[in-house]
């Protein structure tokens, strides 16, 4: 039950995270005009990975796409690539994890296959989350560098006669969405990996050999002085799981492929 919950929660958290990564990638507000300590303008500039926008006080917003590929900064291209890789891996991870969910039955899929799929999706979510966090962090670093550069040359002009205020950019909402989404995807991936451990069918260390006496039924188990004495047909054989002796009543029952949760 705990494994199913962990797997399900991991899936949901990753789903939210990937939706957030997609949202962040599509958002226009990766960098926004810094309003602090600047003259108040009737124009607000903000930029995304795909286009830059200008919102005027009039209410009119104009967005222009970056219609060049070669003319864009290498860092921007790298961020785009990281975000897209994150989305692709996340999407594949989601697809894999749907079939890996314990609550979904596909034919006669073995638990071992489900465990492998869960692990695969978990790793994909972790890498996806890391890609998003890396992409957003690279962009943030780029912004910080440019911010201090433009602060150093805040005013430029002809002999100081005419002042041209340089537009400085600061962190936009998309960066925070990206960080949170990347973190959620990462957490979801870790949860899937944890769930995988519980899903894997555990092999018995020893094969139990039972000897039935006529009146007295004694089960001898090599590898430990663990034996059970029972009377008549009430005898319950004990299986040793990882060296621990527990009655079948006590052994945690993992749903087999015939169980419906």
């Amino acid at each position: 039950m705990a494994v199913t919950a962990c797997q399900g929660l991991g899936f949901v958290v990753s789903l939210i995270g990937i939706a957030g990564i997609i949202a962040a990638t599509c958002m226009d507000q990766w960098s926004t005009q810094d309003l602090y300590n600047n003259p108040v303008t009737a124009v607000f500039n903000y930029q995304g990975l795909w286009r830059s926008c200008v919102r005027e006080s009039s209410g009119f917003t104009e967005c222009r796409g970056y219609f060049t590929l070669l003319g864009l900064p290498a860092m921007l291209q790298a961020v785009r690539a990281l975000m897209i890789v994150g989305i692709v891996l996340g999407a594949i991870g989601l697809l894999v994890s749907i079939f890996a969910l314990k609550c979904i039955r596909i034919g006669s899929m073995e638990d071992s296959a489900k465990a492998n799929m869960t692990l695969t999706s978990g790793i994909m979510f972790i890498v996806s989350g890391l890609c998003a966090i890396a992409g957003v962090s690279v962009f943030a670093n780029m912004l910080v560098t440019n911010f201090w550069m433009s602060t150093a040359n805040m005013y430029t002009g002809m002999g100081g006669m005419v002042q041209t205020v340089q537009t400085r950019y600061t962190f936009g909402a998309a960066l925070f969405v990206g960080w949170v989404a990347g973190g959620l995807t990462l957490i979801g991936g870790v949860m899937m990996c944890i769930a995988c451990r519980g899903l894997a069918p555990e092999e018995t260390n020893y094969k139990a050999v039972s000897y039935h006496a006529s009146g007295h039924s004694v089960a001898y188990k090599p590898g430990g002085f663990k034996a059970s004495t029972g009377f008549g047909s009430n005898t319950k054989n004990k299986k040793i799981y990882d060296g621990g002796a527990r009655t079948e009543d006590e052994v945690q029952s993992y749903p087999s492929k015939h169980d419906y949760v």
Epitope: T41, A42, V43, S58, T164
Partner: antibody, heavy 118, light 113 residues
């Protein structure tokens, strides 16, 4: 057709108050930033106040800050300018304007005259 | 505050003449985000509110005759009337639409000789 009609002007004593209204029609009022501009006799226009479409951003000219309040009622398609502590230098024709591309004042009303005199 | 300086303060012209008036701002009105200059030109006739002629320094408002042309960038702007008509006699104002407060120039009065 875009139409802006100002009202509420008149003669007022120094230190007095007045509330101007601007009824808008012919466009989506809640989509545009609006402004008040005044023009003293034989002088050039002077921007007074601005309010964004959602009233999130409000700006005033230094000469009126603390004395004038701009507001809008999008449900009624109406812009307001509440003026208090009026001075003789506030005497002017007050125009209501709708902003357009480039933050230009694309449409103007015919104005309402405010006279501050003892 | 941004200071808008218009010159000359008045112009005496004859019909059909080409007229040029200047407007200078104390700071650049060029927005780096869209490479547009936030400068507007208005025409005002006696007893009327100002009328929008040109926005973004060079974009003509719809319905404005093509004899009106705006040019310039950064801090120096020009309004040109290629062939002055009698109905063009008015006061022309430039306005900063980039920084608050949204300041106007003192105007250039166009008069007939």
């Amino acid at each position: 057709e875009v139409k802006l009609v100002e009202s509420g002007g008149g003669l007022v004593q120094p230190g007095g108050s007045l509330k101007l209204s601007c009824a808008a029609s012919g466009f989506g009022f809640s989509d545009y930033g609006m402004a008040w501009v005044r023009q003293a006799p034989r002088k050039g226009p002077e921007w007074v106040a601005f309010i964004s479409n959602s009233a999130y951003s409000i700006y005033y000219a230094d000469t009126v800050t603390g004395r004038f309040t701009i507001s809008r009622e999008n449900a009624k398609n109406t812009l307001y300018l509440e003026m208090s502590s009026l001075r003789s230098e506030d005497t002017a024709m007050y125009y209501c304007a709708r902003l357009g591309y480039g933050n230009s004042f694309a449409y103007w009303g015919q104005g309402t005259l405010v006279t501050v005199s003892a | 505050d941004i200071v808008m300086t218009q010159s000359p303060s008045s112009l005496t012209v004859t019909a059909g003449e080409k007229v040029t008036m200047s407007c200078k701002s104390s700071q650049s009105l060029l927005n780096s985000g869209n490479q547009k200059n936030y400068l507007t030109w208005y025409q005002q006739k006696p007893g009327q509110p100002p009328k929008l002629l040109i926005y973004w320094a060079s974009t003509r408002e719809s319905g404005v005759p093509d004899r009106f042309t705006g040019s310039g960038s950064g801090t120096d702007f020009t309004l040109t009337i290629s062939s002055v008509q009698a109905e063009d006699l008015a006061v022309y104002y430039c306005q900063n639409n980039y920084y608050y407060p949204l300041t106007f120039g003192a105007g250039t009065k166009l008069e007939l000789k």
